[in-house]
Structure formats: structure tokens, C-alpha cells
């Protein structure tokens, strides 16, 4: 019994004075507290407790239950301890089947011993099976068995408390280790698709997927800059142990131009957090909007390809398209894809190609789109670069010499004369009258130049030039003069092309 | 005698919060999980979650996910369980309920909380 | 997660019959070949009281009328003999995985 100074308040004597007592089950158990402050009586097991305010404890018949410990208590407070063994050979164990540890730390297995000596007190797997190698426990006979630093591997594990009583094993009820598993890194989460593109009154719904080791991760729709508490609905799933998936879903059944933003689902666990985003827009009605991938005035060489080509948003998708060319469609020589395969793609590219070119085929060409909102069009002008032709080379009665010339763009036509029989035509003549014609083909067509010289400048035999140019190419006619007397002869034009 | 008492009954307007106790005697607290379980009137019972022994570790029912949190004042042997954004549909008893050798075994009078505007 | 379904939703029954009602969980709450399967009775006003606990084990102080059974998904509360008293509803619940689940409940009235 404890011994403390006189004057000072002093515990309680219990009898039998002894820490432990070992009964017989259907014996009694009678103990005294001896205390002039005397409160209570207080019994303990499997951290279960009952209180007597006698200062005798008496338990006529014993049984395994009544094992544990036994507190009298005084009005300082001060207390004093006995710990009751009620030995049953049919019952060794008093147990609590619950088992419950979070990784890494340790957990009670709750199976004191009704007899202190017994030997052996350790765990066993159930069936036979061995316990895994790097289990480790400390066994404690008035309260279970701990087991040291559990691990996941452990979850599920089946368990017996284990005696040897008169040479044989003797093994508790079983219990079921469930490891609450640590978390070691941040959940982790995707969304269903990164951007959102709506018409006002269709519905938005988003899934959020979080993956981490437990249920225990939370996560959260939320939109960003806003309080809104948002709708969310859960699905769930334990893919095996550790492996926990579940998916937010986020709806708004009517979306509202003024929806329209990033909402952000969020989760964390202890160990840190994890986002993903998804934007929203939502529009009051569809569009398109078209990008011309090249210029929409287009110049090309006769006998040379090109193509027009146009990349479009349209949202909702593209229902009709056409290029048009002259009030005729174009059945073939064009394709219309889709930029991405995206499944929210809203952007398109539609591809004419144009192949050997004739002059006769420049023009506006159109392209057409439209959706279930709305229509658009673009217009490429095409302009096919010629080399001049000449189309009439003629002495007019007026004497006037004269050169008609067709070409894109608009030919010049420059005069030489060529004294004798020279092959070099140097000196330039200056023409009297030049003007550019309507063309009666269709616009962008050839343009058409005319210009004339006054033939009676002349004085001697020679040949007269026109040469007619452009960026493309030039083209040449000739006059040839021969004078008998003071009388010019006829004039004989004819043409020399040169590249 | 394992006891569990819970506060009184709550009238609370849609939105507010409400934080139920349940105050445990007759056994060590910090050695038994705490459950919480509601009981719509006339329904049935849905299990909220459990606030575990020794770390105070949670573990919710995701149907409260965000809403929920259990907690306990060692001190006083208290288990507290509030619930957040509340909605008429949250009208209903509140239990808390100790688990003892796997099964609910013991458990408070119960704690009406109504949700009304 | 594992859900609870109970037969009869109700049940009206006599003094002195013998009654069953019968829990079918939608996955196996079994671990090892113990069944983490527990049944209660409830009556108006009051919390649930535990009857059953492991599928099959009788609570202390509950009347030896009362027995469970069943392994696995499939599982039986059974009253041998109704008592006055006994008119009650009553739940299976599971705490195999989380989150803990109870069946609907069964409300057993006087015939």
C-alpha cells in the first residue's frame, strides 16, 4: 500500500493489497476500500466502465466478464488499483472485434486474458495462413495485442489472439484488421472535356473525375470569383482496396449567357490539394464566323493551281456547304473536315482547289456555310495573270496604224520603228491615241488596250513594232513599209511572239 | 453504463448551420468510434459518417460530402456533429451512435433538428 | 456502394407467430466467413435498439426469440414467437464497407 507523509491527503488501501488477483470463475470477489474520504468504486474493461458507491465490492459468482480493473477513488481524487483475473478455461479472451488502424500508425487488438498464465500471448493469421513477415506486435495481457506501424498490405487481414494453455493452442474469435490507409500524394483529378460552348436554355452538365486511395478525399465544384453554392450530384466506386474513384457532376439544366465562366473542381486530402478547370460560354444564339486562309484577292498565273481556303467556326456544326463560282456549285474539286477531331471542335477548314487555270476562269468564287442559326458566305476574287495576245494589228483608212491588245493585268503597247533592214527596233514612237477598252467577257477577264500611230511620221522603208507587255509575258506584231516614189506600198503586219 | 446524451432540439431557417453534441460516459471515449445517423420523419436511417478513436480521423457517407463535420472535445467526452447549407430535406432525428465489437451497440436519445423558413 | 434490400416492406402478423424477414445486400459482406451484418428494432419516438450482431450473435439482454442467420449477401431475422412488445420496425445494416449502409426497414404491425 502506498505511504505518503503525515498531514497530506493519502490514497486509498485496498484489500487484498496486492496489484493483481487471480479467481476462480464462480468464486466471489469481495474487496475493501478503506478510506475515511471514501467516493467510489470504479470497474474497467475493454475501456468499459461501472461504478459502485459501497466501499465493498462483492461479486457472488465470478464470471470471465468481471475480469479487469478495479479503481476506489476518495474525495481528493487520490486512487488506488486492483486488476481482477477471472480464470475461465472456456473463455481466455474477453474481445472487441473491432479493429480498426490508420496506416503507419499503431492499433489495439482489444483480447485481454482472463489468465494472466497462460503462455505464449501472441497474434495468429486465421486458417493457418502465417501473418506477413513484417508484422510486429507487443502483446499486453490486461489490455490486447498492439500492432506496430500498420501497414496498407494489412487491410483486410484476418486475425486471432493465441494462447498456449496446458501444451495447446488456443486461438479468440477472429478479427478483421481495416486499414484506413495515409495519404501519400494528391488526389488525382480530370474533367470530362476542358471547354463548354452553349446556346442559351441548353444544359451544361460537367463530370469531374477524383481518384485517391479512400473515400475520405473531398472535393468540390466550384466557379470561379463566386460564393454560389453549385448542384452537384456523386457517383462512386471502390475499384479494390485503395483504389476509390468518384465523379462530381455538375449541372445547370438551363444555361444563361451570364453562366458563362471557369468552374473549377477542387479536391484535396491531408497530404495537399488538386484542381482542373473547365470554361464555359454560353451564347445567346449560334455563329459563324469565317477566316480567310489566304488573301481574299487572289492573282495567278494562266495554266498555274491554286487553291482558296477558309477556316470557319460554326457553332451549332455546319449543316450545308458549297462554293459557289458564276451562280454554278462546284460538285467536286473542294473538301470540308474538321480542324480537330476534338469532341469539342467547333472549328472547320473547307479547301477549293483550282487546277490549270484558264484566263477565262478568274472571277468571285464563294463560299458558302451555314448552320441551324445562321448562314455565312466569304468571296475570293480571282484575277488569272495572261500574257498579252494581240488581237488585231491594222492600218486604218486614216492612215492610222493601230494594235489591240488583251491581257491581265492590263497590257502596255510601246511602238519601235526599224529603219532598213534592221532586226533591232530601238526608236520608240510615240503612240497618238491609246485607251483600255471594256472588256464584254466577265470582270476579272483579260483587259483589253488599244493604241495607234500616226503611219505618215515614216519616210523611209522599215518595219514598225507594236509590242504589247505585262508582268507575264510580251507579244510583238510587225508592220513592214516600202516606198516607191513619194508612195508608201501596203503595209504587211505580222506577229512575232516572244516569251 | 455506457451513456450517450444528446443537446436538444433545433429549429433552424434554410441555409444556416446546426452543431448537435453527444456526450458520452461510462467507458474510456477516446476508445471507440463515434457514428452519426439521421433519420428522416417517417424514413428510414442513413449512416452520416464516423469520427474514429484515438487520431480523430472522419470518414463520411459522400452524400454530406462538403457539408459535414464531425469533431470531439476529449476533455468533456463530447462528439460534435455539424451540418452546414442546411434545406428542409435535412429536417430529422439525429443520432450519435458508439461502435462497440463492430455493431452500433449503444446510442443517444436522438436530436430533432427541423429546417423550416 | 453496398446496398440493403428488405422483404416485406410490412408485415402484419398475430401474437404467438413465428415471422421472418429476410435482408439481400447487392454485394457480399463477408470477410473471412464473418459476416459484418447486424439487425435492429426501432419504435416510435426511440432510438434503434441492437438485436443481432455478426449476422448471428444475440445481443446481451435481447430475448431468445430473436435469432439471425445468413452469410454471404443473403440474410434472415427471425421472431419465433411475436410478442406484444415486438411490434416494432426493424433494419439490417452492414458496416462491411463504408459507407455503412441500413436496409429500408420493415414495419411489423399487429394483424
Known amino acids: 500500500q502506498p505511504s505518503v507523509s503525515p498531514g497530506e491527503p493519502s490514497p486509498p488501501s485496498i484489500h487484498p493489497g496486492k496489484s493483481d488477483l487471480i479467481v476462480r470463475v464462480g468464486d466471489e470477489i469481495r474487496l475493501l476500500c478503506t478510506d475515511p474520504g471514501f467516493v467510489k468504486w470504479t470497474f474497467e474493461i475493454l475501456d468499459e466502465t461501472n461504478e459502485n458507491k459501497q466501499n465493498e465490492w462483492i461479486t457472488e459468482k465470478a464470471e470471465a466478464t468481471n475480469t479487469g480493473k478495479y479503481t476506489c477513488t476518495n474525495k481528493h481524487g487520490l486512487s488506488n488499483s486492483i486488476y481482477v483475473f477471472v480464470r475461465d478455461p472456456a473463455k481466455l479472451f474477453l474481445v472487441d472485434r473491432s479493429l480498426y488502424g490508420k496506416e503507419d500508425n499503431d492499433t489495439l487488438v482489444r483480447c485481454p486474458l482472463t489468465d494472466p498464465e497462460v503462455t505464449n500471448y501472441s497474434l495468429k493469421g486465421c486458417q493457418g495462413k502465417p501473418l506477413p513477415k513484417d508484422l510486429r506486435f507487443i502483446p499486453d495481457p490486461k489490455a490486447g495485442i498492439m500492432i506496430k506501424s500498420v501497414k496498407r498490405a494489412y487491410h483486410r487481414l484476418c486475425l486471432h489472439c493465441s494462447v498456449d494453455q496446458e501444451g495447446k493452442s488456443v486461438l479468440s474469435e477472429k478479427f478483421i484488421l481495416k486499414v484506413r490507409p495515409a495519404f501519400k500524394a494528391v488526389p488525382v483529378v480530370s474533367v470530362s472535356k476542358a471547354s463548354y460552348l452553349l446556346r442559351e436554355g441548353e444544359e451544361f452538365t460537367v463530370t469531374c473525375t477524383i481518384k485517391d486511395v479512400s473515400s475520405s478525399v473531398y472535393s468540390t465544384w466550384k466557379r470561379e470569383n463566386s460564393q454560389t453554392k453549385l448542384q452537384e450530384k456523386y457517383n462512386s466506386w471502390h475499384h479494390g482496396d485503395f483504389n476509390y474513384e468518384r465523379q462530381a457532376t455538375l449541372t445547370i439544366s438551363s444555361a444563361r449567357v451570364n453562366d458563362s465562366g471557369v468552374f473549377m473542381c477542387y479536391a484535396n486530402n491531408t497530404f495537399g490539394s488538386a484542381n482542373v478547370t473547365t470554361t464555359l460560354e454560353v451564347v445567346d444564339k449560334g455563329f459563324i464566323n469565317i477566316f480567310p486562309m489566304i488573301n481574299t484577292t487572289v492573282f495567278v498565273n494562266d495554266g498555274e493551281n491554286v487553291d482558296l481556303i477558309v477556316e470557319y467556326e460554326a457553332f451549332p456544326k455546319p449543316e450545308h456547304q458549297q462554293w459557289i463560282y458564276m451562280n454554278r456549285t462546284f460538285t467536286d474539286k473542294w473538301e470540308d473536315y474538321p480542324k480537330s477531331e476534338n469532341e469539342s471542335n467547333i472549328r472547320y477548314v473547307s479547301e477549293l482547289h483550282l487546277t490549270r487555270l484558264k484566263g477565262t476562269e478568274g472571277g468571285t468564287y464563294t463560299f458558302l456555310v451555314s448552320n441551324s442559326d445562321v448562314n455565312a458566305a466569304i468571296a475570293f476574287n480571282v484575277y488569272v495573270n495572261t500574257k498579252p495576245e494581240i488581237l488585231t494589228y491594222d492600218r486604218l483608212v486614216n492612215g492610222m496604224l493601230q494594235c489591240v491588245a488583251a491581257g491581265f493585268p492590263e497590257p502596255t503597247i510601246d511602238w519601235y520603228f526599224c529603219p532598213g533592214t534592221e532586226q533591232r527596233c530601238s526608236a520608240s514612237v510615240l503612240p497618238v491615241d491609246v485607251q483600255t477598252l471594256n472588256s464584254s467577257g466577265p470582270p476579272f477577264g483579260k483587259l483589253v488596250v488599244q493604241s495607234s500611230i500616226d503611219s505618215s511620221a515614216f519616210k523611209h522603208n522599215g518595219t514598225v513594232e507594236c509590242k504589247a507587255y505585262n508582268d507575264v509575258g510580251k507579244t510583238s506584231a510587225y508592220f513592214n513599209f516600202a516606198f516607191k516614189g513619194n508612195n508608201k506600198e501596203q503595209i504587211h503586219p505580222h506577229t512575232l511572239f516572244t516569251p | 453504463q455506457v451513456q450517450l446524451v444528446q443537446s436538444g432540439a433545433e429549429v433552424k431557417k434554410p441555409g444556416a448551420s446546426v452543431k448537435v453534441s453527444c456526450k458520452a460516459s461510462?467507458?474510456?471515449?477516446?476508445?471507440?468510434?463515434m457514428h452519426w445517423v439521421r433519420q428522416a420523419p417517417g424514413q428510414g436511417l442513413e449512416w452520416m459518417g464516423v469520427?474514429?478513436?484515438?487520431?480523430?480521423?472522419?470518414s463520411y457517407n459522400q452524400k454530406f460530402k462538403g457539408r459535414v463535420t464531425m469533431t470531439t472535445d476529449t476533455s468533456t467526452s463530447t462528439a460534435y456533429m455539424e451540418l452546414r447549407s442546411l434545406t428542409s430535406d435535412d429536417t430529422a432525428v439525429y443520432y450519435c451512435?458508439?461502435?462497440?465489437?463492430?455493431?452500433?451497440?449503444?446510442w443517444g436519445q436522438g436530436t430533432l433538428v427541423t429546417v423550416s423558413a | 456502394e453496398i446496398v440493403l434490400t428488405q422483404s416485406p416492406s410490412s408485415l402484419s402478423a398475430s401474437v404467438g407467430d413465428r415471422v421472418t424477414i429476410t435482408c439481400r445486400a447487392s454485394?457480399?459482406?463477408?470477410?473471412?466467413?464473418?459476416?459484418?451484418m447486424h439487425w435492429y428494432q426501432q419504435k416510435p419516438g426511440k432510438a434503434p435498439k441492437l438485436l443481432i450482431y455478426?449476422?448471428?450473435n444475440l445481443e446481451s439482454g435481447v430475448p431468445s426469440r430473436f435469432s439471425g442467420s445468413g452469410s454471404g449477401t443473403d440474410f434472415t431475422l427471425t421472431i419465433s414467437s411475436l410478442q406484444p412488445e415486438d411490434f416494432a420496425t426493424y433494419y439490417c445494416q452492414q458496416n462491411n464497407e463504408d459507407p455503412y449502409t441500413f436496409g429500408q426497414g420493415t414495419k411489423l404491425e399487429i394483424k
Open positions: 461510462g467507458y474510456t471515449f477516446t476508445s471507440y468510434n
Open positions: 451512435a458508439r461502435e462497440r465489437d463492430t455493431r452500433f451497440g449503444n
Open positions: 455478426l449476422a448471428s
Open positions: 469520427i474514429y478513436s484515438g487520431n480523430g480521423d472522419t
Open positions: 454485394e457480399s459482406v463477408d470477410i473471412y466467413g464473418q459476416s459484418f
